[in-house]
């Protein structure tokens, strides 16, 4: 069952998921100047069995220019920098590292992706938050998420977890920075 | 909480406009696609077209291109519609639709009349 | 355009009953298939998503199936709370589009 809503947002933090529930869509999105085929979903979607999920449809970007009926208004500024080749080569690692049962990895990036990946999240799924770069956990419990079905409503559970800004990075007495997820799980790459 | 909040309902005169606009509340406007959806009784639901918000794309249904026009404005999360040239063809109830599909505002009723 | 047909206009059930809406596409449109559910004077409400998949606080009696170009939307154990109509939805290729719907009179 789909989550209601979005994961909640916590200032200077991003979250992570470690794998996909099936259920989980992907919306397709490309980056300016391109967009999506228009056959095909418009989404790709974590699907299986219990014993092996995968991501259906892929998705497409092909430039906006040769579109008739297709309109583009003024565009609005870029709010992201183009992701990283290198993020987009942990995204391909995190591919053959994660396998739970009844979840999908990370989907590999495709041609003239967007900056920012938009899920569909569905109810038990868990996301895990962390600082971003000049920004360290002040106070920290459990810093996830998860999106839970209570009388018939879903809802995502607060994260417990405060970025503070600071000059230099650093971290409280035997605290690490927080990169890797819990359970030393490796971690995606996100929407947020 | 979701909401998809629609203008109220409009009697106009053939030959004329109406705006429509759809408010949306508790996700990222301008993440998602929003879509607009036609009534009428005996029709069904016809698909006119979507926008997206952010990345400032529209497509139309070919059958609506020259009727319909979607807009949107990210400061307010508010996508829009105008219908032009009106006939009794047009009165019907027009929803916004947004989040793949999954959430639908209360819907505008269009009364095209002289 | 990918035509969406509900070859049933009206279905009749009673309360406790299983029925099954069916809806085909007129070309292959995968699992890319949703429905909805409208009951009078009120604005559909989707119900399931790529061809099986339930939205939240949907009652696990609706279940979807099929793919390619035959799909069905079955309901177990019919509630009174169910007369509605169920439409289908293809977005596999724009335009999207719905079939024309089956009305669900309950006995």
């Known amino acids: 069952e789909l989550c209601d809503d979005d994961p909640p947002k916590i200032t200077h933090a991003t979250f992570k998921a470690v794998a996909y529930k099936e259920g989980t869509m992907l919306n397709c999105e490309c980056k300016r100047g391109f967009r999506r085929i228009k056959s095909g979903s418009p989404y790709m979607l974590c699907t299986g069995n219990s014993s092996h999920s995968s991501w259906d449809n892929q998705c497409q970007c092909t430039s906006s220019a040769a579109r008739n009926t297709t309109k583009q208004v003024t565009p609005q500024p870029e709010e992201q920098k183009e992701r990283k080749t290198t993020e987009m080569q942990s995204q391909m690692q995190l591919a053959d590292q994660v396998s739970l049962p009844g979840h999908c990895r990370e989907p590999p990036p495709w041609e003239n992706e967007a900056t920012e990946r938009i899920y569909h999240f569905v109810v038990g799924q868990t996301v895990y938050y962390q600082c971003v770069q000049g920004y360290r956990a002040l106070h920290r419990g459990p810093a996830e998420s998860v999106c839970k079905m209570t009388h018939g409503k879903t809802r995502w559970t607060q994260p417990q977890l405060i970025c503070t800004g600071e000059t230099e990075p650093s971290q409280f007495p035997g605290e690490e920075e927080p990169q890797a997820s819990p359970d030393g799980l490796p971690e995606s790459e996100t929407s947020r | 909480q979701i909401q998809l909040q629609q203008s109220g309902a409009e009697l106009v005169r053939p030959g004329t406009s109406v705006k429509m606009s759809c408010k949306a509340a508790?996700?990222?406007?301008?993440?998602?696609?929003i879509g607009w959806v036609k009534q009428r009784p005996g029709h069904g639901l016809e698909w006119i077209g979507d926008?997206?918000?952010?990345?400032?794309?529209?497509n139309y249904n070919e059958k609506f291109t020259g009727k319909a026009t979607l807009t949107a404005d990210t400061s307010s999360s508010t996508a829009y519609m105008q219908l032009s040239s009106l006939t009794s063809e047009d009165s019907a109830i027009y929803y916004c639709v947004s989040r793949n599909f999954a959430n639908w505002g209360q819907g505008t009723l269009v009364t095209v009349s002289a | 355009d990918i035509v969406m047909s509900q070859s049933q206009k009206f279905m009749s059930t009673s309360v406790g009953d299983r029925v099954s809406v069916t809806c085909k596409a007129s070309q292959n449109v995968g699992t890319n298939v949703a429905w909805y559910q409208q009951k009078p004077g009120q604005s559909p409400k989707a119900l399931i998503y790529s061809a099986s998949y339930r939205y939240s606080g949907v009652p696990d009696r609706f279940t979807g199936s099929g793919s390619g170009t035959d799909f069905t939307l079955t309901i177990s154990n019919v509630q009174s709370e169910d007369l509605a109509e169920y439409f289908c939805q293809q977005y596999n290729s724009y335009p999207y589009t719905f079939g024309g719907g089956t009305k669900l009179e309950i006995k």
């Open positions: 508790g996700y990222t406007f301008s993440n998602y696609w």
């Open positions: 926008i997206h918000p952010g990345g400032g794309y529209i």
